[in-house]
């Protein structure tokens, strides 16, 4: 049994880091493998992650971490029984993938303005709370070409757009994702999408 693709990990910079790797053949990850991880810190204790299958030869492990900060560095040991298959390290702050925003809502009752709001996925005491920027994706269910991205570079988790910038009388969907420049993160996953029917009064033409 050998590791074909070494583990690569990303952290949500809050409580979970996710590591993925590939073995050289079909593997029952949860019964055959264990990923041990330990913070390089005084008094830290070793923890064991039981991986799950992610495709035939792929494995994924969700590492639980408390109080993640920039100084943290973890040692990783991948074991198959008594055999050490791979040894490495992981610094969560250098591989951050933010959590996806939640509770995306479209408010259509503001005079010909669409107000989209969502929730910041981090608590106020997490460093990323005040450092997320967002991308909002809006698209038409009827017209695949009607697809647009709005970059929200301010901190408030909301976006206002004129309803008239979208076509009237048809259904749209929206979703939002986040990233943080301070840690040069990757983009988060998209939030679940929300749907609304866009309708507004056309200006009266003589």
């Amino acid at each position: 049994m050998k590791v074909l693709q070494e583990p690569t990990c990303v952290s949500d910079y809050m409580s979970i880091s996710t590591c993925e790797w590939k073995m050289n053949g079909p593997t029952n990850c949860s019964t055959e493998l264990r990923l041990l991880y330990q913070l390089v810190f005084l008094l830290s204790e070793a923890h064991t992650c039981i991986p799950e299958n992610n495709g035939g030869a792929g494995c994924v492990c969700h590492l639980l971490m408390d109080d993640v900060v920039s100084a943290d560095n973890y040692t990783l040991d991948l074991w198959a029984g008594q055999q050490l298959l791979w040894k490495g390290s992981f610094k969560p702050s250098e591989h951050v993938k933010p959590r996806a925003p939640g509770n995306l809502t479209v408010h259509t009752n503001v005079s010909d303005t669409l107000l989209l709001t969502w929730s910041n996925p981090y608590p106020p005491d997490n460093y990323l709370y005040n450092h997320l920027t967002y991308a909002v994706n809006i698209w038409s269910e009827n017209d695949p070409a009607d697809f647009r991205i709005y970059n929200v570079t301010y901190l408030e988790p909301s976006l206002r757009i004129a309803a008239s910038t979208l076509k009237s009388g048809i259904s749209y969907r929206a979703r939002v994702r986040a990233w943080a420049q301070c840690y040069n993160t990757t983009w988060s996953e998209w939030s679940p999408s929300t749907k609304w029917h866009n309708s507004y009064r056309e200006p009266f033409e003589q």
Epitope: F41, L43, E45, D66, V69, S70, A71
Partner: antibody, heavy 116, light 111 residues
Framework: QVQLVQSGAEVKKPGASVKVSCKAS????????MHWARQAPGQGLEWMGI????????SYAQKFQGRVTMTRDTSTSTVYMELSSLRSEDTAVYYC?????????WGKGTLVTVSS | QSVLTQPPSVSAAPGQKVTISCSGG????????VSWYQQLPGTAPKLLIY???KRPSGIPDRFSGSKSGTSATLAITGLQTGDEADYYC????????????FGTGTKLTVL
């Protein structure tokens, strides 16, 4: 919100021991290390040691080895710091502080006076 | 126990900028992260800066930290009378056994 409530002031004679408590609330007690530091009157901060409330393991500053004992009670989310063989130079305010690489939250401090 | 060196005192008028230095060595600041603590008279220390330059929520952006080599600096702009306090830098000494160490402390007077 996070609160670290320390026990009240103590007056001790040289050679005696003192046990200071620090009751934590507002967070997952076993998820954060607890440090102890002290500050003599008009002096700076001095680190004494650290305890991992999860397993109870400890590490002490060399200066206090053999004289200090840190323990915890997970049922009450309380950590304790006991200092023995007290001398006059141990007169100080003793602080518990939650954190790992840095100390996020501090107790208000417990004044321990050592005097004959 | 090694100590980080800070100036005993600094002073400036309200509205001005002041900086407080913290000098260490390769076994501490040079190889670790720096934090800063504010201690108002008669109170416990409070975390002001961590991770060299990050502010906990609730700390105004008048306070900033930086690190270069084996020294670190705390800068306070738009000084207010309420900033009058003792300031301590902190880091980890990575010699064996590793342990946190604090600076000697700086008394800030707002004139």
């Amino acid at each position: 919100q996070v609160q670290l409530v320390q026990s009240g002031a103590e007056v001790k004679k040289p050679g005696a021991s003192v046990k200071v408590s620090c009751k934590a609330s507002g967070y997952a007690f076993t998820s954060y290390y607890m440090h102890w530091a002290r500050q003599a009157p008009g002096q700076g901060l001095e680190w004494m040691g650290i305890i991992n409330p999860s397993g109870g393991s400890t590490s002490y500053a060399q200066k206090f080895q053999g004289r200090v004992t840190m323990t915890r009670d997970t049922s009450t989310s309380t950590v304790y710091m006991e200092l023995s063989s007290l001398r006059s130079e141990d007169t100080a305010v003793y602080y518990c502080a939650r954190g790992k690489w840095w100390l996020y939250d501090w107790g208000k401090g417990t004044l321990v006076t050592v005097s004959s | 126990q090694s100590v980080l060196t800070q100036p005993p005192s600094v002073s400036a008028a309200p509205g001005q900028k002041v900086t407080i230095s913290c000098s260490g060595g390769s076994s501490n600041i040079g190889n670790s992260y720096v934090s800063w603590y504010q201690q108002l008279p008669g109170t416990a220390p409070k975390l002001l800066i961590y991770d060299n330059n990050k502010r906990p929520s609730g700390i105004p952006d008048r306070f900033s930290g930086s690190k270069s080599g084996t020294s670190a600096t705390l800068a306070i702009t738009g000084l207010q009378t309420g900033d009058e306090a003792d300031y301590y830098c902190g880091t980890w000494d990575t010699s064996s056994p590793p342990q946190p160490i604090f600076g000697t402390g700086t008394k800030l007077t707002v004139l």
